[in-house]
């Protein structure tokens, strides 16, 4: 999918009212310098594109973050302020079922979730370019 | 400390596949990071080709993305290169490296590969 | 695409001398840019990130300076191991990342 033609403002807005708080919220009782940060973006598309791919894409060592709360408000977020994105997302969506089944909290989910907060402090940067 | 060693043919024709395999060593590919495609034509400058990240994601250079293939098998913790179609301009020294997905900090010595029949 | 112009060609330079390589971004990169560099027959090595950080291990004499369209590597004193081609690189433009033709400094 091509994030280029998302509101981006409407996003970044979703996040600072709930998304941010439900990352806080899932990496309680961890120390923001506990996890070093690897990956960063460019430009907003960018962000969002690998904020999608480390969200809902299965890794090693942690299954699914897809039925976590912070991930539903993101797929919520960018199924209304990116056109075209909900029709791209039915295997996504088929994932998140599948994933609710079981809900653990690895280490490696929440350096995974260290991760999304610096891709989404990126998004918001000011300067960030749009595209 | 992370090492990256670049392996494949010296010499492919032209119209055929070009295929490259990166090796990583000292640190696993499928734990952080992006793992990028680089290349130099001799006595010229750098053209970033993509990337595939940590988790997945795959991200190309637009005046290569209708050619190019990369892929990851972290079992091996190895990550590839594909060019189809190549002709003489594609002739290079291609480079492997660790990206945040932005810059690059650490790379592969180096593969020249050549077009030529 | 964002063109990266890197000036001057060749730097002619004797060891202990300072230079000034100069990279110019085609339109604003803000500071998302890197310098690299190139010893023959070897691969890049990153110097400077984000316009002004310092790479793990890099000397304090290499230093980056600029924002926007405009950008200064500076090499205090040249060591004799310096001598080599330097290249910035934008990252401001996903997914069009590109790099400028290179500064050669050599020794004088």
């Known amino acids: 999918y091509d994030f280029t033609n998302c509101d981006f403002e409407k996003i970044k807005a979703a996040y600072l009212s709930t998304i941010s708080k439900d990352l806080i919220t899932y990496m309680s009782g961890t120390k923001s310098t506990e996890f070093n940060n690897t990956v960063s973006c460019s430009n907003r598309p960018h962000c969002l594109t690998e904020i999608q791919s480390l969200t809902f894409n299965p890794t090693a060592g942690c299954a699914s973050l897809a039925k976590e709360m912070f991930a539903m408000k993101t797929k919520a977020a960018l199924a209304i302020w990116c056109p075209g994105y909900s029709e791209t997302q039915i295997n996504a969506t088929q994932a998140m079922k599948k994933a609710r089944k079981s809900k653990v909290t690895t280490n490696k989910c929440l350096e995974q979730v260290s991760q999304l907060q610096g891709l989404w402090r990126r998004f918001n940067r000011p300067l960030l370019k749009q595209q | 400390q992370v090492q990256l060693q670049e392996s494949g043919p010296g010499l492919v024709k032209p119209s055929e596949t070009l295929s490259l395999t990166c090796t990583v060593s000292g640190y696993s590919i499928s734990s952080g990071y992006g793992w990028s495609w680089i290349r130099q034509p001799p006595g010229k400058g750098l053209e970033w080709i993509g990337y595939i990240s940590y988790y997945g994601s795959i991200s190309y250079n637009p005046s290569l993305k209708s050619r190019v293939t990369i892929s990851r098998d972290t079992s091996k913790n190895q990550f590839s290169l594909k060019l189809s179609s190549v002709t003489a301009a594609d002739t290079a020294v291609y480079y492997c490296?660790?990206?945040?997905?932005?810059?690059?900090?650490?790379w592969g010595q180096g593969t020249l590969v050549t077009v030529s029949s | 695409e964002i063109v990266m112009t890197q000036s001057p060609a060749t730097l002619s330079l004797s060891p202990g001398e300072r230079a000034t390589l100069s990279c110019r971004a085609s339109q604003s990169v803000s500071n998302n840019l890197a310098w690299y560099q190139q010893k023959p027959g070897q691969a890049p090595r990153l110097l400077i990130y984000?316009?002004?950080s310092r790479a793990t291990g890099i000397p304090a004499r290499f230093s980056g300076s600029g924002s926007g369209t405009d950008f200064t590597l500076t090499i205090s004193s040249l060591e004799p191991e310096d001598f080599a081609v330097y290249y910035c690189q934008q990252y401001s433009d996903w997914p069009q990342y590109t790099f400028g033709q290179g500064t050669k400094v050599e020794i004088k």
């Open positions: 984000d316009a002004s």
């Open positions: 490296a660790r990206t945040n997905l932005l810059y690059f900090d650490s």
